[in-house]
C-alpha cells in the first residue's frame, strides 16, 4: 500500500501512545463547501434495491438525528417492476464517528463514539451454498 | 436567569478559547461491539452496480484512512454479466465527521471537519428528460 511519511513528532492514531484526551475545536469546517454533490435524495426510490429511511434519534448524541436505511425487499426490482428473489437487496453500512457527552451532563467534555449505520441498499448476486 | 450548577467533575473551561475548544476522549467506544454485522466487504464485487474502493489517507486526519467508493461503470450489470446503459450506477454519499489536526502536526489539538464520502454504489432507473 501507499506509505505516507509520518511526522516523527506526531503520534500515530493507531498507536497505543496516541493521546487519549485531546482539545477539539467544535467550529466545524466543511470540506465540501465548493462542491455541489448530486443529492442522493431520490435514489432510495429509484434504486433496484429501494430503501426506506428511519429516524434514529438520541438527544445526548451529536448528530442527534441519524437517518438509517432499511431495504424494502429481500429481492431486487426487475425491469418489469417486480421483485426478483434471485437477487438480494442488501444494506451498505459504514462506521461513523459521533460525539457523546462524557461524563453525562458535562457541557465541555465529550467522547468519540463509533456507530455502524446503513446508508442505503445495493442489489447483489446471492451467494449460493451447494449441498454436498 | 436560570443558574445551572456546574459539575465539579467536569473539565475546566476557563480557557481564552472556550467555548470553541473542548476536551474529547479519543478512547473510542464502539456501539457495535456486540453485533456481528454481515460484512459488506464483498458487496462491491457482487453488486449489479459494482464499485472500486480507493484508499484516501491523510495522517493529519482522524481517522487517517477512509475508503472511498467509485462506481466501476456508468450502467449496471445485467443478468448476462454485461453493462446495461439503460440503468445507472450511482454513488451513495454520506457526510461524516472527522478530526483534523489544527494547527497542522500538533498531536493534541484538532478541529471537527465534515466531509462527504461515497460509501458504495446502487443501481437506479435514470431520470429521462423529454425534449419538448
Amino acid at each position: 500500500g501507499i506509505t505516507i511519511p509520518r511526522n516523527p513528532g506526531c503520534p500515530n492514531s493507531e498507536d497505543k501512545n496516541f493521546p487519549r484526551t485531546v482539545m477539539v475545536n467544535l467550529n466545524i469546517h466543511n470540506r465540501n463547501t465548493n462542491t455541489n454533490p448530486k443529492r442522493s435524495s431520490d435514489y432510495y426510490n429509484r434504486s433496484t434495491s429501494p430503501w426506506n429511511l428511519h429516524r434514529n434519534e438520541d438527544p445526548e448524541r451529536y448528530p442527534s438525528v441519524i437517518w438509517e436505511a432499511q431495504c424494502r425487499h429481500l429481492g431486487c426490482i426487475n425491469a418489469d417492476g417486480n421483485v426478483d428473489y434471485h437477487m438480494n437487496s442488501v444494506p451498505i453500512q459504514q462506521e461513523i464517528l459521533v460525539l457523546r457527552r462524557e461524563p453525562p451532563h458535562c457541557p465541555n467534555s465529550f467522547r468519540l463514539e463509533k456507530i455502524l449505520v446503513s446508508v442505503g441498499c445495493t442489489c447483489v448476486t446471492p451467494i449460493v451454498h451447494h449441498v454436498q | 436567569g436560570i443558574t445551572i450548577p456546574r459539575n465539579p467533575g467536569c473539565p475546566n473551561s476557563e480557557d481564552k478559547n472556550f467555548p470553541r475548544t473542548v476536551m474529547v476522549n479519543l478512547n473510542i467506544h464502539n456501539r457495535n461491539t456486540n453485533t456481528n454485522p454481515k460484512r459488506s466487504s464483498d458487496y462491491y464485487n457482487r453488486s449489479t452496480s459494482p464499485w472500486n474502493l480507493h484508499r484516501n489517507e491523510d495522517p493529519e486526519r482522524y481517522p487517517s484512512v477512509i475508503w472511498e467508493a467509485q462506481c466501476r461503470h456508468l450502467g449496471c450489470i445485467n443478468a448476462d454479466g454485461n453493462v446495461d446503459y439503460h440503468m445507472n450506477s450511482v454513488p451513495i454519499q454520506q457526510e461524516i465527521l472527522v478530526l483534523r489536526r489544527e494547527p497542522p502536526h500538533c498531536p493534541n489539538s484538532f478541529r471537527l471537519e465534515k466531509i462527504l464520502v461515497s460509501v458504495g454504489c446502487t443501481c437506479v432507473t435514470p431520470i429521462v428528460h423529454h425534449v419538448q
Epitope: 467544535l26 467550529n27 466545524i28 443529492r39 435524495s41 431520490d42 432510495y44 426510490n45 430503501w51 426506506n52 429511511l53 429516524r55 434519534e57 438527544p59 451529536y62 448528530p63 442527534s64 438525528v65 441519524i66 437517518w67 457527552r101 451532563h105 457541557p107 | 445551572i4 467555548p19 470553541r20 457526510e95 465527521l97 465534515k114
Partner: antibody, heavy 124, light 109 residues
C-alpha cells in the same frame, strides 16, 4: 432564491379551525435536506414552534406538545406548498403565524427562510 | 422542555458600541443546534448565526456567536444604526424540543 408566501384568513371565530397555507418557490416541499414548519408569535408567548413536516422516503410529522391534539400540517406536492390547520381555537391562539424552512442537514438545524407572517385574530 | 433565558431584556447602547447578548439554557444543548435571529418591527425573524458560531449568508462580520453547553453569547462588535432590533436565540434538542428565548431588545440610548 427560495421564498415562502403565506395565505389565509386573518380572523377566525372561537372553536373553529384556523387554516393557513405556505407556497414554496425555489425549493421543493419534498426536499430531503429541509423540513417545513410553522411558528407563531404573540406578546404573551413570544416565538413558539408549532410543528414541521419533512420527507425522507415517507412523510414525517412532528408537533409541539402544547398543540399536538389540535394541529395538522399537510404537504401538497402538486402545488409545492404546505398547510397548517389548528382546531378548536381560542383567543389565546391569536398571534402572528409564520411558515419557515428548517435546514435539516443532520449536523445543523435552523430556520433560514421565513414567510411574511399572517396576523390571525381569534374573536367572535 | 428546555427553557432559554435571554439577558438582559433590554440593552440601551449608542451606535459604535459593543453589544453582548446572553442566552442561557436550562440544560445542555448541542452548540451545533443553537441559532440566533434578528427581528425588526413588522418583519419576520432573520437568521444571523447557526451552529452557535457560524454566520449565515450575507450577515456582516460584526456579528459573532460563541458558547457551548448551557451558555451562549451573541456579540455585535460595533453597533450600526440598522442593528437596533430584537434578538432571539433558538435551540433544537430533539425533533419535539425546539424552543426560542424571550428576546433581547437592543435600543438606542
Amino acid at each position: 432564491q427560495v421564498q415562502l408566501q403565506q395565505s389565509g384568513p386573518g380572523l377566525v371565530k372561537p372553536s373553529q379551525t384556523l387554516s393557513l397555507t405556505c407556497a414554496i418557490s425555489g425549493d421543493s416541499v419534498s426536499s430531503s435536506s429541509a423540513a417545513w414548519g410553522w411558528i407563531r408569535q404573540s406578546p404573551s408567548r413570544g416565538l413558539e414552534w408549532l410543528g414541521r413536516i419533512s420527507y425522507r422516503s415517507k412523510w414525517y410529522n412532528d408537533y409541539a406538545v402544547s398543540v399536538k391534539s389540535r394541529i395538522t400540517i399537510n404537504p401538497d406536492t402538486s402545488k409545492n406548498q404546505f398547510s397548517l390547520q389548528l382546531n378548536s381555537v381560542t383567543p389565546e391562539d391569536t398571534a402572528v403565524y409564520y411558515c419557515a424552512r428548517e435546514v435539516d442537514s443532520m449536523y445543523y438545524s435552523y430556520f433560514d427562510i421565513w414567510g411574511q407572517g399572517t396576523l390571525v385574530t381569534v374573536s367572535s | 422542555e428546555i427553557v432559554l433565558t435571554q439577558s438582559p431584556a433590554t440593552l440601551s447602547l449608542s451606535p459604535g458600541e459593543r453589544a453582548t447578548l446572553s442566552c442561557r439554557a436550562s440544560q445542555n444543548v448541542w452548540a451545533f443546534y443553537l441559532a440566533w435571529y434578528q427581528q425588526k418591527p413588522g418583519q419576520a425573524p432573520r437568521l444571523l448565526i447557526y451552529g452557535a458560531s457560524n454566520r449565515a449568508t450575507g450577515i456582516p462580520a460584526r456579528f459573532s456567536g460563541s458558547g457551548s453547553g448551557t451558555d451562549f453569547t451573541l456579540t455585535i462588535s460595533s453597533l450600526e444604526p440598522e442593528d437596533f432590533a430584537v434578538y432571539y436565540c433558538q435551540q433544537y434538542r430533539s425533533t419535539l424540543s425546539l424552543t426560542f428565548g424571550q428576546g433581547t431588545k437592543v435600543e438606542i440610548k
